[in-house]
């Protein structure tokens, strides 16, 4: 619900957004995701930091853990054991990479109202979790895995070979965390807690990235991370499973890798438990167009895991890489052998398929010139998923229910007509057996979270409606936003345009292109945001545009895989094409056009500035990739193949920013990077700067000492203030 626009006399009381509003997070929104603990109960941390249990059916709630207890150990997070006897309290949070962090853990006994003393957990712990049933604990400390049958028991050590930067047990190394698993953990309990599966990553032979961390000491520290760049030696992964009831009996048993995968370099991509004695592993060849899903069974007689070839399912792409960003994971049905999975159909759109015996005999469940995006839950009679089908807007997300108990299966859109103007981009969170679910709407209006009955889809209550935000925005002149498409040479380019509040088509406005453009990304989404570009439109009178070109997601494989083995070409072309179309619209001042982006967007903005079109007056690249030889193997090779003569070295060399140094001569370029960027290494910007200096091309630069890829904290304020000055100067806007 965007605040209604007021006119005439009241317009004087309205004010534009300020940069301060953005940097202070004045107009940030809240979401409500229930922490489900059963079919009808969830936990939530109240405003005063008590942990409260809500029972939907009785309508009653009560506190299970007081803020006093939380505060006594400075806890910032908690986790209830499934048997409801204990809570772990997490404190001393210390961030490592994108998902990983270490913390101190305390176990609180709810029955006695006191902390468990004796056999306390070591510190800091890298990962800790309860078993899915009861109150067993698995945790990772110093790269080794430990098991406790009960919180007060002494630990049983499962692995012994863990070594910093060498062997990782139960947690991923850098590249698996960032580019494959997207988690801080690499261990998985079986559904009833009988078995614990875990990954071991051996990084012994991986080259190390080293950079200085300046800190406050006399000498800087050197940070060393095993980080495989494109073409380098990769981690060696093995999967083990241990019986947690009798862990010392036979010890961890290795799960065999499918022969067709093991014949060359490969990755492990995910593990899904089906039952306590059946597990599903997904593997991927290093050349990431072949994925194998392997279903393995426990053999009681040998105490080993057997993965018959008949239970191997191959997924192969002939036009690009396997999957979207990641290979999708299966959602098993109640028979514990058949499953639902999203992959490309014969028309090149990602859709839900039902696999009972072989992939070749898969039954297609959804179809159309749109894409199924996520399978949330499969119950005995329903499958809940999200897609961008509704009204043919790829940047929307609605939740659908397919009845799988009846034939033919019927489909119902659960969200399409709930709050049609306000809510067009949803996600969902389901309780056990999908008895209830929460819907979280991200926009385009002010976000709202609601609770629903899983059988009737009736709304039970509003969990969070951001009333304070709505009131705060009542006197703000927000920019107007529109999402439309351009049809160019059989390519559909969706764009979002953010227009100044008093936009007048007969006037000329400076244009800023904000680009990301990475493979399988999507920037044009129907979501709410009050951010830096909202301020630039509201206060500084700029038009901002975001364009989804070739390589972006959820519009079919033709668009997605167009960039395969050719990064840095079509993404840039499509931004340029869109700019030309925007100029034709008549309200853009073609002498004042800029482009900016971060990460992959910094790469694209740099290439666009160096395209020699003369379209851009200036631009900004924040933490850009400058050569694909500098970036992580798992990500880069997925889209580019290997940087070898007999593979794709030529395009690796042709697609660098440095190769275009000469072309920056006629643009104003601002290059920005954090010196402690573990992800896109400072090396990338250092090489751009060197090439520009060598070409005697003037440019502006800003580094952020000891900052990573996110440029967080005080750096954020400095960054956006600095970029604002740069753009205002470029567009001749007074300060």
């Amino acid at each position: 619900l965007r605040p209604s626009r007021v006119h005439n006399s009241e317009e004087n009381t309205m004010r534009a957004l300020t940069l301060k509003d953005i940097l202070n997070g004045t107009f940030s929104y809240k979401t409500f995701f229930p922490n489900w603990i059963s079919g009808q109960e969830y936990l939530h941390q109240s405003a005063d930091n008590n942990i409260v249990l809500y029972n939907i059916e009785t309508g009653q709630s009560y506190t299970i853990l007081s803020n006093r207890t939380m505060k006594s150990v400075n806890a910032s997070n908690y986790g209830l054991s499934p048997d409801r006897q204990f809570v772990y309290l997490e404190s001393d949070y210390s961030k490592l990479w994108r998902y990983s962090y270490t913390a101190t853990y305390y176990i609180y006994d709810l029955s006695n109202g006191e902390f468990v003393r004796g056999n306390e957990l070591p510190r800091p712990i890298q990962y800790l979790c309860w078993s899915p049933v009861g109150s067993k604990l698995a945790y990772v400390y110093q790269n080794n895995i430990y098991l406790k049958q009960r919180p007060g028991d002494p630990p049983f050590q499962i692995t012994f070979n863990g070594r910093e930067n060498k062997i990782f047990n139960g947690i991923p190394d850098w590249v698996y965390e960032e580019e494959m698993l997207a988690t801080k953990y690499a261990l998985w309990w079986s559904p009833n807690g009988k078995f614990l599966a875990y990954a071991e990553f051996n990084d012994t032979d991986i080259p190390v990235i080293a950079y200085s961390y300046y800190g406050d000491e006399q000498y800087p520290r050197t940070i060393n991370i095993p980080y495989p760049k494109a073409g380098a030696k990769n981690p060696v992964v093995r999967i083990f499973i241990i019986d947690t009831t009798y862990p010392a009996y036979v010890g961890p048993q290795e799960v065999p890798v499918p022969a067709m995968i093991a014949s060359s370099d490969y990755y492990f991509s995910w593990l899904t438990w089906v039952t306590d004695e059946r597990v599903c592993l997904q593997w991927l060849k290093r050349v990431q167009n072949v994925s194998v899903l392997s279903i393995c069974d426990f053999r009681e007689d040998w105490q080993t895991w057997d993965c018959p070839k008949t239970q191997e399912h191959i997924e192969e792409s002939r036009t690009g890489w396997a999957g979207g960003f990641f290979v999708s994971t299966p959602v098993f049905s109640y028979d514990a052998i058949s499953y639902y999975k999203i992959f490309s159909d014969k028309d090149g759109y990602k859709h839900i398929h039902y696999i009972k015996d072989t992939v070749e005999n898969a039954i297609q469940i959804t179809s159309g010139k749109w894409e199924a995006i996520n399978i949330f839950r499969v119950t005995q009679d329903s499958l809940f998923y999200s897609s961008n089908e509704f009204e043919e807007y790829p940047g929307r997300r609605n939740i659908y229910r397919i009845s799988i108990g009846s034939y033919p299966p019927s489909k119902k859109c659960v969200t399409c007509h709930l709050r049609k103007e306000r809510c067009q981009y949803y996600t969902a969170s389901f309780s056990d057996y999908a008895k209830y679910y929460a819907l979280v709407c991200y926009g385009p209006g002010i976000p709202i979270s609601t609770l629903h009955d899983g059988r009737t889809d009736q709304e039970i209550k509003i969990l969070e409606e951001n009333k304070e935000l709505e009131n705060a925005l009542k006197n703000i002149q927000l920019p107007k936003e529109e999402i439309k498409k351009l049809e160019v040479d059989e390519i559909t380019l969706w764009y979002k345009m953010i227009l100044p509040p008093q936009f007048d088509r007969s006037k000329k406005y400076p244009l800023l292109i904000q680009v990301y453009g990475g493979p399988c990304s999507q920037s044009v989404r129907s979501v709410f945001a009050v951010n830096w570009i909202s301020y630039l439109a509201s206060k500084e009178g700029m038009v901002i545009a975001l364009v989804d070109g070739r390589g972006t997601a959820f519009q079919g494989d033709k668009l997605l895989y167009a960039v395969y083995r050719k990064l840095g070409v079509y993404e840039v072309e499509d931004q340029i094409t869109a700019v030309r179309k925007f100029i034709e619209m008549g309200f853009i001042d073609e002498k004042r056009i800029a482009i900016w982006g971060w990460s992959y967007g910094g790469y694209v903005s740099s290439l666009a500035l160096a395209s020699g079109t003369g379209l851009f007056k200036c631009g900004i690249a924040v933490a850009p990739v400058s050569s694909w030889e500098y970036y992580a193997s798992v990500y880069t090779e997925r889209f580019m193949g290997l940087p070898t003569k007999d593979d794709n070295l030529e395009h690796y060399k042709n697609s660098t920013v440095m190769a275009r140094a000469e072309y920056f001569r006629n643009v104003d370029y601002l290059l920005i990077h954090g010196t402690a960027d573990d992800n896109v290494h400072f090396q990338n910007s250092a090489q751009i700067a060197k090439a520009l200096v060598n070409a005697q091309v003037d440019f502006q630069a800003m580094w952020y000492s000891d900052q990573n890829h996110g440029l967080s904290g005080l750096s954020t304020n400095h960054l956006y203030t600095h970029m604002t000055h740069f753009l205002k100067q470029c567009f001749s806007l007074s300060d």
């Epitope: 059963s38 109960e41 059916e57 009785t58 506190t63 853990l65 709810l110």
Partner: nanobody, 119 residues
Amino acid sequence: QVQLQESGGGLVQAGGSLRLSCTASGTFSGRNAMAWYRQAPGKRRELVAGIRSDDSTNYVDSVKGRFTISRDNAKNTVYLQMNSLRPEDTAVYYCNLWPPVIGAGFGSWGQGTQVTVSS
């Protein structure tokens, strides 16, 4: 204000049976997740059995197959049927929400009911 009243304890010989009852009064709904807990002399209180709103149950290993938790929503009452009792089952038995409630109006445990199993 909500009160929980446990009853049904007593002295019983090993191998015998007892049925404990717990009745909730006040605004409380008996359909909340409920549990039986026990505390043996000199030991910490521990969970014995729990029953969720959907009537699914949980038992600690030591009582599995011997104890049964059940409820009567109409009477706001939770029961614990204890069979094949052993001397080590001797304790004060309490009922409470599962997990137990803390805080105003419901913050303390009831008196409990004493179960003594003689050998």
